[in-house]
Interface confidence: low
């Protein structure tokens, strides 16, 4: 007869490992007992379990409650055992020794490999601001056995760098994603993808990029100069900008206080029925935590009685 087993059995941490050992005997041969032991190099054999044809299963104290026979129906020539809830410390060499009658004893070894799936973590880098050079956007770390693969999935242009730290029974891999921040990246997802043979599917952690910026300011509302005449109702100026964080707006008049009746509503300056008193230089001040911008316009309210044309100057400053 001969003994059938596997060279390597691979399980995921927490799963049950089947350690196979089957005696393919000639007609009439019987198995008296199967002894399982752990036989790592440099260490003495540690008994695991004994499957006896008459006495049944005995489990050594060190493995009490963790070793079972496979469920019935069982073949009397099958000496396989189940090692419940495999932990990393179970990784190593195992030996089954089969005592048969009348052929004698046979033994075979297998290696148990315990895959430790990683639990990845993503750490965002420092605050991103437009105008910075190459900056760390995020780093992603995953530790497992064997070493996991850490990659990035994103539409954002950037560079990656990885490093690995080997531990006694596992390896930690850290990958960093660097980029040159621009406003177009704002709100874009940056996903760390961790692959590992012990994972049913890749693990993904997504970080949403936040890039601080403030666009140039401009004022809308003076496109048609002829509309700005005495008596006109509903005249307004709107300050245009965008930023992250969203900016706040403030209106002032360069050549004096805002005229009475002029309403400030965030980015909009609303005028009562126009008079010549509303002529002047108005300044929109846009700011957020990142920067500030100004845009000023000259309003010249026309008197329909006069023939003179209106002049409008637009000046932007930052």
């Amino acid at each position: 007869g001969e003994l059938e087993t596997s060279d390597v059995v691979t399980v995921v941490l927490g799963q049950d490992a089947k350690l196979p050992c089957f005696y393919r005997g000639d007609s009439g041969e019987q198995v008296g007992q199967v002894a399982w032991a752990r036989v790592d190099a440099g260490e003495g054999a540690q008994e695991l379990a004994l499957l006896h044809s008459k006495y049944g299963l005995h489990v050594s104290p060190a493995y009490e409650g963790r070793v079972e026979q496979p469920p019935p129906p069982r073949n009397p020539l099958d000496g396989s055992v189940l090692l419940r809830n495999a932990v990393q410390a179970d990784e190593g060499e195992y030996e089954c020794r089969v005592s048969t009658f009348p052929a004698g004893s046979f033994q075979a070894r297998l290696r148990l490999r315990v895959l430790v799936p990683p639990l990845p973590s993503l750490n965002p880098g420092p605050a991103l601001e437009e105008g910075q050079g190459l900056t760390l956007a995020a780093s992603c770390t995953a530790e497992g056995s064997p070493a996991p693969s850490v990659t990035w999935d994103t539409e954002v242009k950037g560079t990656t760098s990885s490093r690995s730290f080997k531990h006694s029974r596992s390896a930690a891999v850290t990958s960093e994603f660097h980029l040159v921040p621009s406003r177009s990246m704002n709100g874009q997802p940056l996903t760390c993808v961790v692959s590992h043979p012990g994972l049913l599917q890749d693990q993904r952690i997504t970080h949403i990029l936040h890039v601080s910026f403030l666009a140039e300011a401009s004022v809308r509302g003076l496109e048609d100069q002829n509309l700005w005449h005495i008596g006109r109702e509903g005249a307004m100026l709107k300050c245009l900008s965008e930023g992250q964080p969203p900016p706040s707006y403030n209106w002032t008049r360069l050549d004096g206080p805002l005229p009475s009746g002029v309403r400030v509503d965030g980015d909009t300056l609303g005028f009562p029925p126009l008079t010549t008193e509303h002529s002047g230089i108005y300044v929109c001040h846009v700011s957020n935590e990142f920067s500030s911008r100004d845009s000023q316009v000259t309003v010249d309210v026309l008197d329909p009685q006069e023939d003179s044309g209106k002049q409008v100057d637009l000046v932007s400053a930052s």
Epitope: T10, Q15, D16, P71, L115
Partner: antibody, heavy 126, light 107 residues
């Protein structure tokens, strides 16, 4: 994105043959075991056949053994089911499904079916 | 072959109800058990694998428990999209076998 698309179903007379195909995309086909599962109209699910990457081990339900043959062409990322000597009781929607890549390389255990195709209807009738 | 017996075969429940479906194997299968959801005209969808592990993307209101021969699928708070037929499947041996299904209907 993992996609499985079956084709080849249709109406066939008892005793006839059909070959079902399942085109896989969105993953490394060679790394995964595959199965065929069928569902007769108004009935439950029945596993038909499976093929493993490990030793290309092919297994069959007793109800189709000797009549159906499962195979795969890894170069085309395609799974096949050759069905011969068809019977009325073979009438069903046939799904191809991917078995998730489990970590133990031995043939006695199959694994859960994590992705399924949309199914193709096989009708065996005279 | 291992026989998988599901109960009940059908049940009526309301949105928000806690629903429990049981599955019994004719022999021990450790934790080699999966649960699937199937809606009319659609392919089954994997919900639970390894008896109690939630498949990625499946809402946490679904949970599984059990080992050996007795298993349970629980929906903690039934949602409108949960009305479907549920199947258990053992994959411990070949052929893998399914339960006969449990149809969850609106009360």
């Amino acid at each position: 994105e993992v996609q499985l698309v079956e084709s080849g179903g249709g109406l066939v007379q008892p005793g006839g043959s059909l070959r079902l195909s399942c085109a896989a995309s969105g993953y490394s086909f060679t790394d995964y075991d595959m199965s065929w599962v069928r569902q007769a109209p108004g009935k439950g699910l029945e596993w038909v056949s499976g093929i493993k990457t490990y030793k290309s081990d092919a297994r069959y339900a007793d109800s189709v053994k000797g009549r159906f043959t499962i195979s795969r062409d890894n170069s085309k990322n395609t799974l096949y089911l050759q069905m011969n000597s068809l019977r009325a009781e073979d009438t069903a929607v046939y799904y191809c499904a991917r078995e998730y890549s489990d970590v133990v390389d031995y043939v006695s255990v199959r694994t859960p079916l994590d992705y399924w195709g949309q199914g193709t209807l096989v009708t065996v009738s005279s | 072959d291992i026989q998988m017996t599901q109960s009940p075969s059908s049940l009526s429940a309301s949105v928000g109800d806690r629903v429990t479906i049981t599955c019994r194997a004719s022999q021990g299968i450790s934790s080699y058990l999966a649960w699937y959801q199937q809606k009319p005209g659609k392919a089954p969808k994997l919900l639970i694998y390894a008896a109690s592990s939630l498949q990625s993307g499946v809402p946490s209101r679904f949970s599984g428990s059990g080992s050996g021969t007795d298993f349970t699928l629980t929906i903690s708070s039934l949602q409108p999209e949960d009305f479907a037929t549920y199947y258990c499947q053992q994959h411990y041996t070949t052929p893998p076998t399914f339960g006969q299904g449990t149809k969850v209907e609106i009360k």
